[in-house]
Each structure stands twice: as C-alpha cells, then as structure tokens.
C-alpha cells in the first residue's frame, strides 16, 4: 500500500536517456504524444512533475520475511496528465486522469549506475519504461541479466 | 531481524590488497543495495561504492582504479577488495544496507559494526 | 562531487535545551538527505531520511527540514543519550557524500 495519500516530495526535471537523448511531451490531435529525440542546442528541456510516494510493502509479500518500503513515482509532464503504462499493448502514455492515480501512474525507482534511475511498472513487476525506436515503450527484464540495460535507464536533472 | 556483520584482516601491509567480507542476514541481497563506508578521525566518512539490487556496481571515482565490490547471492555475502594500500587507508571500514528497496534515495538504514583496518608496515 | 558543509563543527547545550544544526549541499540535491548519529565505538544510525521523514524507532524531538541546498536539523529537549557526534549525507547522486560532522557537547 502506497502510505498516505500525499508524495514525501516532490521536483521538476528533465528526462533523458543513458545516451543524452531528451524526453519531449508534444500536443497533436488534443492528446500528447512523447517522442525520443536530440534537441538542438538552443530548444529548452520539457519538465516533468516527479512526485515520490513511499510505499509498504508488507513481510507477507516481500518473500524474504522483512517489511520494506519502495519508493514509488508519479511522472506528470503538464497539469492533469500522467505517464502510464499500458500493459496490454507494451506502451507508455499520456493520459488526464483525476486523482487518486490508477496504479498504472505509479512505478517503483530503483538507482542504477552512472547515476542514473529505471522506472518499473508497479502493476508488472519486471517490466520498466524503455526506449524502443525512438519512443518509450514497456521492456521486461530479466532480473538475472539485464538491470544494467542502457534502454531502461534515465538521467533526472533539474 | 536485520544484520551485517563485517570481517576483515585487520592489518595490511603497505603497497598489498585488502580483502573484506560483509555477511548479511534477514533481507535479501536482490532487493536491498550494500555500500561500503570507510571512516577515519581526520577525514571523516567517505562512501566507497555500492553493490546494488540486480547487480550494478558504482564507485566513488577518487578510489575506483583500486576498488573492486562483488557478491555471493547464494551466501549472502558482499566483497570489498582494494589494491595497493597505504597508510592513509587506514580506517574503519563499514557496510551499510539501503533504507528503500532498489533505491538508496533513503539513506543507510542499517550498518555493520565495523571492522579496523590498519596499515603498517 | 557534491560537497556537504555541516555547521557548527561543535555545539555545547544542556539537557532539555533544543539544537539545530545546518548543512549546505555545494548544488541542488531535491529532498534527498539524510541526518545520522554515531555514538563513540558505534555505527552511524539513520534518523531522518529524504530530508523530513523520521526513520522508524527514532524519537519526534527529532525533526528535519529543507530541501535543494539548505538543510537543518533539530532535537527537541536533549537527552543524555544525545551528546555525540551527527552527519548529513547527500543521497541525490553518486559518490554519497557525508559532512563534516558535528559534535554535540553538554
């Protein structure tokens, strides 16, 4: 259970990939579209909202007897709309939504090397946001061998 | 009941290899990250690198040609080598485990006790 | 790296009294800080993390704030127990960087 309703804390930063490529957040058509890409020198970063929830994550669950806590977080790049994942089709969208947040907005951070952080799907353990030909997408990982994969990693800087 | 306990040789000969063991119990090595911390009178605590959940090792870059950190999941065992020591080496030396699961944004909920290492010839 | 400059290096008080001590983070590091205290012989302890939250088992005298660069830390009505030594550490990106310390004296 996510403890509380309200984040521990939260900022404003820019997304990019392992590669320095930016996170941008585009309105086409009334709804967001996020691309992958090289911004040009002069074009500003697109901010995302990251709020961090704590989250319990009982003994009973954990499988190795102890309580832990996670720490979970929303990702909203403008008022109203949220990152989520969309496990049926392996994507990652935007989408307005009211709170409280369906699960689908909440991803468990976990720090990786180089500074950087992963996001993992908190209703599909295993599976993180990635980037796939130029587009975020879902990407299931196998523990035992691909934590460190460049596509799921992510610099966050404010 | 949550517990790291370090081992090491406590005394190192000048220009040789430190070796030292954190064994950990009551969480489990994939889900927790371990750092190791060294502490000395006059430079205070100094983080070394971490061993973290899946994996992934980091460095303090200061140390990172002579540091080596690795794991036996199996034994719930974490290893600290460092090469060429000198007398400046010489500290206190401690693992620590992540307060959050995956995540060391939390801070170091729990340490070791900690084990003296001196260097002398 | 980031560099943690924690003030006073040494503060004397007396039983009941209240503290605040300040740390300074060289560039932004969000809310991810965390105080400790480490008694003579001892390993550092959590107490607080991500800057406010209190770690589990540790008194409410205790309490932290700020966020960004600036830092304080503050115990309420000391206790005996509570004349040792106390650091911050930046958690916001690697190496982790602890202060100076500062040492708590009746």
């Known amino acids: 259970s996510i403890t509380g309703i309200s984040p521990i804390t939260e900022s404003l930063a820019s997304l990019s990939t392992y590669n320095d490529q930016s996170i941008t957040f585009a309105l086409e058509d009334e709804s967001y579209e996020i691309y992958v890409e090289d911004l040009k020198k002069d074009k500003k970063k697109d901010k995302v909202l990251l709020s961090y929830y704590e989250s319990q994550h009982p003994s009973s669950e954990s499988g190795d007897g102890v309580d832990g806590k996670m720490l979970m977080v929303t990702l909203s790049p403008t008022k109203d709309f949220w990152l989520q994942a969309n496990n049926k089709e392996h994507s990652v969208e935007l989408h307005k939504c009211e709170k409280p947040l369906p699960d689908q907005a909440f991803f468990v951070l976990h720090n990786r090397s180089f500074n950087c952080v992963s996001f993992e799907c908190k209703t599909d353990p295993g599976v993180f946001i990635g980037v796939k030909d130029n587009h975020l997408a879902l990407i299931k990982v196998d523990y035992s061998e691909n934590l460190g994969s460049e596509n799921i990693l992510f610099k966050l800087s404010e | 009941q949550v517990h790291l306990k370090e081992s090491g040789p406590g005394l190192v000969a000048p220009s040789q290899s430190l070796s030292i063991t954190c064994n950990v119990s009551?969480?489990?090595?994939?889900?927790?990250?371990v750092h190791w911390i060294r502490q000395t009178p006059g430079r205070g605590l100094d983080w070394l690198g971490v061993?973290?959940?899946?994996?992934?090792?980091s460095y303090n870059s200061a140390l990172m040609s002579r540091l080596s950190i690795s794991e036996d999941i199996s034994k719930s065992q974490v290893f600290l080598k460092m090469n060429d020591l000198q007398t400046d080496d010489s500290a206190i030396y401690f693992c620590?485990?992540?307060?959050?699961?995956?995540?060391?944004?939390?801070?170091?909920?729990?340490w070791g006790q900690g084990t003296l290492v001196t260097v002398s010839a | 790296d980031i560099q943690m400059t924690q003030s006073p290096a040494s503060q004397s008080a007396s039983l009941g009294e209240s503290v605040t001590i300040t740390c300074l983070a060289s560039?932004?590091?969000?809310?991810?800080l965390a105080w400790y205290r480490q008694q003579p012989g001892k390993s550092p302890q959590l107490l607080i993390y991500?800057?406010?939250r209190l770690a589990d088992g540790v008194p409410s005298r205790f309490s932290g704030s700020g966020s960004g660069t600036k830092f304080s830390f503050k115990i309420n009505n000391l206790q005996a127990e509570d004349f040792v030594i106390y650091y911050c550490?930046?958690?916001?990106?690697?190496?982790?960087?602890f202060g100076g310390g500062t040492r708590l004296e009746m």
């Open positions: 009551g969480f489990s090595l994939s889900k927790y990250g």
């Open positions: 550490q930046q958690l916001n990106s690697t190496p982790y960087t």
């Open positions: 560039q932004t590091i969000g809310a991810w």
């Open positions: 061993l973290r959940a899946g994996g992934t090792i």
């Open positions: 620590a485990r992540d307060h959050y699961y995956y995540s060391s944004f939390g801070g170091f909920a729990s």
């Open positions: 991500a800057a406010t």
